[in-house]
């Protein structure tokens, strides 16, 4: 029994890392294989993961962590019964994937601008809290042409547009995703969209 | 807001045994080590002991055998069971949430130690 | 065990000066962890730097932290009437613990 390809792990900066890796053939992963990690630090444990297989050769882990900060540095070994297949370390803050933001809500009832708001997926103690930047993606259902994305690039988890930059009368829907310049983290998934139905009063047209 | 308030100070004489608590809040203190810092008066700081996520600790020499570290995550609590007191424990005992280095503490609360 | 040693003992200033306050350790130590800390009277300490240059959440940029090895500095630019106080470097070490400097008095002039 090989790894194939080395495991490659990315941290949320909150309480959870997934690693991923393959093994050079099919492999109940939870039976066969552990993942021992360990903060490089005098007050920390080792762990054990059992991992889940991702695909025939693949495995996957989720490894729970203590709140992240920059300078975590952790031991991974990957296990087969009594045989170390592979050593590594990772430092999470190297390897950010923000986690997806919630509660993503449409307000129509303001005069012809839609306010767009959702939560910040991070406590207020957590360093990324003050550092997330936001893409909001509204595409309208009827027309896959009509896809727009806008960049938040304030820290505020909103967005106001007029409404008539969309079409009246038709249903849109709407997502949106984080990221972390400072510790240039990859985009995180985008949270569930929400849907909600455009209209608008034209204005008055005089001839 | 993290917050940490510690109790439990109070006069003691040489000898004798004091149990210090600290109350946090604001933040998930399962995911986070724990620490105690003590500054005697008019002195500079010294860390005394700390805890791990997983219950492991360590002691400054001039604690060690002397002083328990523990917590209590169901109830967000840390503890301080200090035995064999000696003048020289007189100090402010503060809390403080950390890792590397400390980045909340509490106000701290005054242990004398004196016959 | 790691000595950290501050100079200098006091720092005597007036506001609008800057500040430089130096913490030499006995032996080399790592930048990730070196922190700082000021303390005011009757206060707690409060984080002002870590990983010897990164500012804690809204500390104002006035206070950098350079240096590494067994040097380290922490400046303040442009003293403000609230900046004067007690500052503490300190340091983590995998096998010895925590360990702090004695501290430097910043007063006024």
């Known amino acids: 029994m090989k790894v194939l390809q080395e495991p490659t792990c990315v941290s949320d900066y909150m309480s959870i890392s997934t690693c991923e890796w393959k093994m050079n053939g099919p492999t109940n992963c939870s039976t066969e294989l552990r993942l021992l990690y360990q903060l490089v630090f005098l007050l920390s444990e080792a762990h054990t993961c059992i991992p889940e297989n991702n695909g025939g050769a693949g495995c996957v882990c989720h490894l729970l962590m203590d709140d992240v900060v920059s300078a975590d540095n952790y031991t991974l070994d990957l296990w087969a019964g009594q045989q170390l297949l592979w050593k590594g370390s990772f430092k999470p803050s190297e390897h950010v994937k923000p986690r997806a933001p919630g509660n993503l809500t449409v307000h129509t009832n303001v005069s012809d601008t839609l306010l767009l708001t959702w939560s910040n997926p991070y406590p207020p103690d957590n360093y990324l809290y003050n550092h997330l930047t936001y893409a909001v993606n509204i595409w309208s259902e009827n027309d896959p042409a009509d896809f727009r994305i806008y960049n938040v690039t304030y820290l505020e988890p909103s967005l106001r547009i007029a409404a008539s930059t969309l079409k009246s009368g038709i249903s849109y829907r709407a997502r949106v995703r984080a990221w972390a310049q400072c510790y240039n983290t990859t985009w995180s998934e985008w949270s569930p969209s929400t849907k909600w139905h455009n209209s608008y009063r034209e204005p008055f047209e005089q001839h | 807001e993290v917050q940490l308030v510690e109790s439990g100070g109070g006069l003691v004489q040489p000898g004798g045994s004091l149990r210090l608590s600290c109350a946090a809040s604001?933040?998930?203190?399962?995911?986070?080590?724990m620490f105690w810092v003590r500054q005697a008066p008019g002195k500079g700081l010294e860390w005394v002991s700390g805890?791990?996520?997983?219950?492991?600790?360590s002691y400054a020499d001039s604690v060690k055998g002397r002083f328990t570290i523990s917590r209590d995550n169901a109830k967000n609590s840390l503890y301080l069971q200090m035995n064999s007191l000696r003048a020289e424990d007189t100090a402010v005992y503060y809390c403080?949430?950390?890792?590397?280095?400390?980045?909340?503490w509490g106000q701290g609360t005054l242990v004398t130690v004196s016959s | 065990e790691i000595v950290l040693t501050q100079s200098p003992g006091t720092l005597s200033l007036s506001p609008g000066e800057r500040a430089t306050l130096s913490c030499r350790a006995s032996?080399?130590?790592?930048?990730?962890?070196l922190a700082w800390y000021q303390q005011k009277p009757g206060q707690a300490p409060r984080l002002l730097i870590f990983?010897?240059?990164s500012r804690a959440p809204g500390i104002p940029d006035r206070f950098s932290g350079s240096g590494s090895g067994t040097d380290f500095t922490l400046t303040i630019s442009r003293l403000e009437p609230e900046d004067f106080a007690v500052y503490y470097c300190?340091?983590?070490?995998?096998?010895?613990?925590?360990?702090f400097g004695q501290g430097t008095k910043v007063e006024i002039k």
């Open positions: 990983g010897a240059s």
């Open positions: 300190q340091q983590y070490d995998h096998s010895a613990g925590w360990t």
């Open positions: 032996q080399s130590v790592s930048s990730s962890y």
């Open positions: 805890i791990g996520t997983g219950g492991a600790t």
């Open positions: 403080a949430r950390g890792r590397y280095y400390f980045d909340y």
């Open positions: 604001g933040f998930t203190f399962s995911r986070n080590a």
